[in-house]
């Protein structure tokens, strides 16, 4: 692999944590790290056919890390797509022109040197601009294991044209049964996107109890179709030794 510059072209300030190299000393080794993680937050890219896609993984490390790309977990070679692709090592990016439906998939950048390896995955969907069913970002909502009394946030990233209706549901039991007479699971609607519902893509649970453990579903629909993805919440009691000790001796104030 070609070696990109360890400078991050996206950052004007010098945020490097490395020690500057002097004439006589070798720089301290630094495992790869993201220099602009906030620019990598958008994971789902829904792009019309024929447009250009640019994925970036701005990084640094000492020595200079290498950059390589996978598609759906496998080595991605230019001859794997019509028109190939361009890797811009100076800006830690891959560019694919004139995308087509066969370009759909997960694209992973791997940045590594001898002191470590980091990776990040983007999801590409090639869409018709005309109305389509909702698309949900893979891996969201994510499973959570939290302590009793904690607050929990589930997130669902949605791409939809037209405007989608978002519901958060929880699978429940009725009279000891999870399935109703209509052969559909019993669910409780926890939240839905209405006129006044802000941030419908996020479900927040406060001060959770063990009874709130279970499966939570993000269900998104528009007039063309629907999509849903679910996650499990596990609420755990703290182990006995983790509980606060009960003070039996008197407290003396000096």
């Amino acid at each position: 692999d070609a070696l990109p510059s360890s400078e991050d072209d996206d950052d004007d300030d010098d945020s490097s944590s490395e020690e500057k190299e002097t004439d006589n000393t070798k720089p301290n080794p630094v495992a790869p790290y993201w220099t602009s993680p906030e620019k990598m937050e958008k994971k789902l890219h829904a792009v019309p056919a024929a447009k250009t896609v640019k994925f970036k993984c701005p990084s640094s490390g000492t020595p200079n890390p290498t950059l390589r790309w996978l598609k759906n977990g496998k080595e991605f070679k230019p001859d794997h797509r019509i028109g190939g692709y361009k890797v811009r090592y100076a800006t830690w990016s891959i560019i694919m022109d004139s995308v087509v439906p066969s370009d759909k998939g997960n694209y992973t950048c791997i940045v590594e040197n001898e002191y470590g390896s980091i990776n990040h995955t983007y999801q590409l969907d090639v869409v018709e601009r005309s109305p389509h069913r909702p698309i949900l970002q893979a891996g969201l909502p994510a499973n959570k294991t939290v302590a009793l009394g904690s607050n929990v946030e589930f997130m669902c990233k949605v791409y939809s044209d037209p405007q989608p209706h978002i519901q958060w549901l929880k699978h429940i039991e009725v009279n000891g049964s999870k399935i109703g007479p209509d052969n559909l699971p019993y669910v409780q609607i926890l939240k839905h996107s209405g006129i006044n519902s802000s941030d419908a893509e996020v479900l927040t649970l406060f001060n959770v109890t063990e009874a709130q453990s279970g499966e939570y579903v993000c269900k998104v629909s528009n007039y063309i179709g629907e999509a849903n993805q679910s996650a499990w919440l596990t609420v755990t009691r703290p182990a006995l030794e983790e509980r606060p000790a009960v003070m039996t001796s008197p407290l003396y104030l000096e």
Partner: antibody, heavy 116, light 109 residues
């Protein structure tokens, strides 16, 4: 190589409808491209109007969306622009262009004047 | 909607280097394209995908893009380079094309 040629009336009355056609030669309008309209008022910059894919899928400039219709005729290998309720502010050179993420080539442009 | 900001004018002496900037929020995440337009003519693509040149465009034309600024660089400027230059992106968030306001390049002398 692909060439584009705009045609249509050079003069349109206020409140009327501007209609232009772009003929595509040297390539198929059914290729993986967006077929676009861009305009340039006299002495001013370029303004994107909208675009169409051969499937009929469209995207329009929000500031013009209520007045714009772009259509494609695959049998004639051409696409068209209709802009309704025109005013003097719509006087411009109108270009058609082939687009992926960028535009190449462009038509030579046609001046449309809105005047009574 | 996404806004691209260009300086209205840039002046340079023949043989020198001209740099035309195009500012936009996190523009480094987008692919930027540049057009040259001479009076009475249609625009011509001179740089695409930040830094690639179409065939027939001299090597003197180059581009870069990072952070909040994309730059078109014209080295060894010639009198024939005098024109208006426009940057353009496809804004993936709004799914719309956007042009900068244009920069008039004047070659002095």
């Amino acid at each position: 190589q692909v060439q584009l040629q705009e045609s249509g009336p050079g003069l349109v009355k206020p409140s009327g409808t501007l209609s232009l056609t772009c003929a595509v030669s040297g390539g198929s309008i059914s290729s993986n491209n967006w077929w676009s309209w861009v305009r340039q008022p006299p002495g001013k910059g370029l303004e994107w109007i909208g675009e169409i894919y051969h499937s009929g899928s469209t995207s329009y400039n929000p500031s013009l969306k209520s007045r714009v219709t772009i259509s494609v005729d695959k049998s004639k290998n051409q696409f068209s622009l209709k802009l309704s309720s025109v005013t003097a502010a719509d006087t411009a050179v109108y270009y058609c262009a082939r687009g992926t993420d960028w535009y190449d080539p462009w038509g030579q442009g046609t001046l449309v004047t809105v005047s009574s | 909607s996404y806004v691209l900001t260009q300086p209205p004018s840039v002046s340079v002496a023949p043989g020198q280097t001209a740099r035309i900037t195009c500012g936009g929020n996190n523009i480094g995440s987008e692919s930027v394209h540049w057009y040259q337009q001479k009076p009475g003519q249609a625009p011509v693509l001179v740089v695409y995908d930040d830094s690639d040149r179409p065939s027939g465009i001299p090597e003197r034309f180059s581009g870069s893009n990072s952070g909040n600024t994309a730059t078109l660089t014209i080295s060894r400027v010639e009198a024939g380079d005098e024109a208006d230059y426009y940057c353009q992106v496809w804004d993936s968030t709004s799914d719309h094309r956007v042009f900068g306001g244009g920069t008039k390049l004047t070659v002095l002398g």
